[in-house]
C-alpha cells in the first residue's frame, strides 16, 4: 500500500481467482483513543472499533472510503483504491491502446518546436467518475523540472456504437535548452483513477523525436507569364523555433489532381518557394519537416490551382 | 578552418558536409520508432558518447559570442564517432552490406573533422569507451544505438554550420 495523495491510498493486488489479497491496517488520524468506530462509504454498518482497523483487501468491494467516527462526529477518512496486476502485468483498462507508432501506446505526445513545450493526449471510452493527474521530468535519477497543466477533455468522437473521449495536457520543461542535443529523455507519468480503480501510464521520449511542425503559412500562387507553371510561395509557421537560419525546415510540395488515382507530382526543397505545373482542377499542397532530423512531417497546407 | 587559436571555419563547406552527414546518418538507420532502443539498457552502451550540451555555446548567441567552444565540442564528437564507426562494432560480424552508407558516413565524419582542425593543431579528444560486444546480435543493437545517437549529434552540428554560414561567414 502506498499514498497517492493525502488520505488516498493505492493497494496493489495480484488479481487471480481466490487470490489472498493484501492485509491493510488503517489508522484514524486523531488524538482520541477511545470510542472510535469505522464505516465504509455510505453504509452505517460498523466494521470495527478502535484507533486502527485491519482489513483484508481482495476485491473492489473492499475498496472505497473508510471513515472513523466518534459519537457521530467524523474524525478522518482514508480512500482505498485498487491497482490490479494480472499475470505480472499492471492492468490498462482505463485508456485505449492507440497502436501508433506501436502496440501498447496509450499516451501520444507532440511538440511544435524545440522550446520544451509539448502536448500529450490519450483516449478512453469512459465518460464519468474519471480523474487524471500528470507529472513529468527530464531524466529520472536526477530529475529536472517539467511543469504540466491539468488534463482536460479535448475532444469527443463517435466510433461505431461507442463514444470515445480524448484528454490532453500541455507541459513545459523549465530549463529547456532548444539548441542542445538531448541526452536524457522526458518522462511523462499519468495517474488515472476510474471509480475505485487506479492505473498508471508512462511515456519516455526525446523532444526531437516528437517534433511535428505546424503547416507552412501564407501559401500563395503566382502564375508565370505565358506558361502553365506557377510559382508557389509560403512561410515558416509562426510556432516554429527561431532563428530560421539555425532551426531550418525542409518542404515537400505536391500537385494533386481531383481524383485520388491521378499521379501526384512531388518536389522537395529547402527554399520557401518552388515552381510547379498547375493542372486544371488540381490543388497544390506544402508540408514541412525539420531539415536535419527526420521527425514527423507537418499536416499539409493547400490551395486550389484555379 | 577553425584553428584552436580562434580563426573562423569554412562555414559554407562545413554546412554542406554536415548536411550530407545528416542524410547519410538517416539512410544508414532510417527506422525511426521501429525499435525503442532506450528499452534495451542504454546506460552501459551509449551513455559515454559526447553530447552537445547547453553549456557548449552551440546556440545562436553562443556562436556569436565565441564559436570556438562549440566548434571544439563538435570536433570532439566527430572524432569520437569516426573512431566508433571504424571500430569492430561496425567492421565485425554481421558484415555490413557492400552498399551500406556507413562507409561514406565514416569518411564524411573524418572529412568534417579535418575541415575543423587542420593537421598540426590539436584540440583534446574524448576517450573512446571499450565497447566490444561478443555476440553479433549485441553488435547489431549497438550499431543501431550509435547511429540513432549520431543522428541527433549531426543534426545539431548541421544547425550550427547552417547558421554560421548564414550569419557568421565573412
Amino acid at each position: 500500500i502506498w499514498e497517492l495523495k493525502k488520505d488516498v491510498y493505492v493497494v496493489e493486488l495480484d488479481w487471480y481467482p481466490d487470490a489472498p489479497g493484501e492485509m491493510v491496517v488503517l489508522t484514524c488520524d486523531t488524538p482520541e483513543e477511545d470510542g472510535i468506530t469505522w464505516t465504509l462509504d455510505q453504509s452505517s454498518e460498523v466494521l470495527g472499533s478502535g484507533k486502527t482497523l485491519t482489513i483484508q483487501v481482495k476485491e473492489f468491494g473492499d475498496a472505497g472510503q473508510y471513515t472513523c467516527h466518534k459519537g457521530g462526529e467524523v474524525l478522518s477518512h482514508s480512500l482505498l483504491l485498487l491497482h490490479k496486476k494480472e499475470d505480472g502485468i499492471w492492468s490498462t483498462d482505463i485508456l485505449k491502446d492507440q497502436k501508433e507508432p506501436k502496440n501498447k501506446t496509450f499516451l501520444r505526445c507532440e511538440a511544435k518546436n524545440y522550446s520544451g513545450r509539448f502536448t500529450c493526449w490519450w483516449l478512453t471510452t469512459i465518460s464519468t467518475d474519471l480523474t487524471f493527474s500528470v507529472k513529468s521530468s527530464r531524466g529520472s535519477s536526477d530529475p529536472q523540472g517539467v511543469t504540466c497543466g491539468a488534463a482536460t477533455l479535448s475532444a469527443e468522437r463517435v466510433r461505431g456504437d461507442n463514444k470515445e473521449y480524448e484528454y490532453s495536457v500541455e507541459c513545459q520543461e523549465d530549463s529547456a535548452c532548444p539548441a542542445a542535443e538531448e541526452s536524457l529523455p522526458i518522462e511523462v507519468m499519468v495517474d488515472a483513477v476510474h471509480k475505485l480503480k487506479y492505473e498508471n501510464y508512462t511515456s519516455s521520449f526525446f523532444i526531437r523525436d516528437i517534433i511535428k511542425p505546424d503547416p507552412p503559412k501564407n501559401l500563395q500562387l503566382k502564375p508565370l507569364k505565358n506558361s502553365r507553371q506557377v510559382e508557389v510561395s509560403w512561410e515558416y509557421p509562426d510556432t516554429w523555433s527561431t532563428p530560421h537560419s539555425y532551426f531550418s525546415l525542409t518542404f515537400c510540395v505536391q500537385v494533386q489532381g481531383k481524383s485520388k488515382r491521378e499521379k501526384k507530382d512531388r518536389v522537395f526543397t529547402d527554399k520557401t518557394s518552388a515552381t510547379v505545373i498547375c493542372r486544371k482542377n488540381a490543388s497544390i499542397s506544402v508540408r514541412a519537416q525539420d531539415r536535419y532530423y527526420s521527425s514527423s512531417w507537418s499536416e499539409w497546407a493547400s490551395v486550389p490551382c484555379s | 578552418r577553425a584553428v584552436p587559436g580562434g580563426s573562423s571555419p569554412a562555414w559554407t563547406q562545413c554546412q554542406q558536409l554536415s548536411q550530407k552527414l545528416c542524410t547519410l546518418a538517416w539512410s544508414a538507420h532510417p527506422l525511426v520508432g521501429h525499435m525503442d532502443l532506450r528499452e534495451e539498457g542504454d546506460e552501459e552502451t551509449t551513455n559515454d558518447v559526447p553530447h552537445i550540451q547547453c553549456g557548449d555555446g552551440c546556440d545562436p548567441q553562443g556562436l556569436r559570442d565565441n564559436s570556438q567552444f562549440c566548434l571544439q565540442r563538435i570536433h570532439q564528437g566527430l572524432i569520437f564517432y569516426e573512431k566508433l564507426l571504424g571500430s569492430d562494432i561496425f567492421t565485425g560480424e554481421p558484415s555490413l552490406l557492400p552498399d551500406s552508407p556507413v562507409g561514406q558516413l565514416h569518411a564524411s565524419l573524418l572529412g568534417l573533422s579535418q575541415l575543423l582542425q587542420p593537421e598540426g593543431h590539436h584540440w583534446e579528444t574524448q576517450q573512446i569507451p571499450s565497447l566490444s560486444p561478443s555476440q553479433p546480435w549485441q553488435r547489431l543493437l549497438l550499431r543501431f544505438k550509435i547511429l540513432r545517437s549520431l543522428q541527433a549529434f549531426v543534426a545539431v552540428a548541421a544547425r550550427v554550420f547552417a547558421h554560421g554560414a548564414a550569419t557568421l561567414s565573412p
Partner: nanobody, 124 residues
Framework: EVQLVESGGGSVQAGGSLRLSCVAS????????LGWFRQAPGKEREFVAA????????NYADSVKGRFTVSRDNIKNTVYLQMNSLKPEDTAVYYC?????????????????WGQGTQVTVSS
C-alpha cells in the same frame, strides 16, 4: 582554460550574513547550470544551491531553504550565494561548480568544472 574563482568567504557570528561570488572564465557561461556545494571538515561534499542556465529553475538543500539565495549575472559571468541567518553548522569550504547540461542539478556528478573553494566560518 576553464577557471572558477570564489570570493567573499570569511568569519562571521551566528545570525550574520555573507555574500559569496564566483567568477567564471574559459567557458560559455550563459549556457551552464551553476551550483554551490560545501564541505565541512571530515564530511562529504554536499549540495547547497543551484541555478539553471536561464534562471528558470533554482534548487536549494533543505538545510538552507529560506536563508540562502542563489543568483547569476550573465553579463559579469558571475554566480552569487547570499547567505543570511548563518548558523555554526554552515561552517565549511564553499565551492562553486558549472554544469554543461545547463540544469540546476543537485547531483555532484553533473558538474564539470569546480573552483578552489572559499572558507566560511560561523561562530556562536
Amino acid at each position: 582554460e576553464v577557471q572558477l574563482v570564489e570570493s567573499g568567504g570569511g568569519s562571521v557570528q551566528a545570525g550574520g550574513s555573507l555574500r559569496l561570488s564566483c567568477v567564471a572564465s574559459g567557458l560559455y557561461f550563459n549556457g551552464n547550470g551553476l551550483g554551490w556545494f560545501r564541505q565541512a571538515p571530515g564530511k562529504e561534499r554536499e549540495f547547497v544551491a543551484a541555478i539553471a542556465w536561464n534562471g528558470a529553475r533554482i534548487n536549494y538543500a533543505d538545510s538552507v531553504k529560506g536563508r540562502f539565495t542563489v543568483s547569476r549575472d550573465n553579463i559579469k559571468n558571475t554566480v552569487y550565494l547570499q547567505m543570511n541567518s548563518l548558523k555554526p553548522e554552515d561552517t565549511a569550504v564553499y565551492y562553486c561548480a558549472s554544469a554543461r547540461s545547463g540544469y540546476a542539478s543537485i547531483s555532484i556528478n553533473e558538474y564539470d568544472y569546480w573552483g578552489q573553494g572559499t572558507q566560511v566560518t560561523v561562530s556562536s
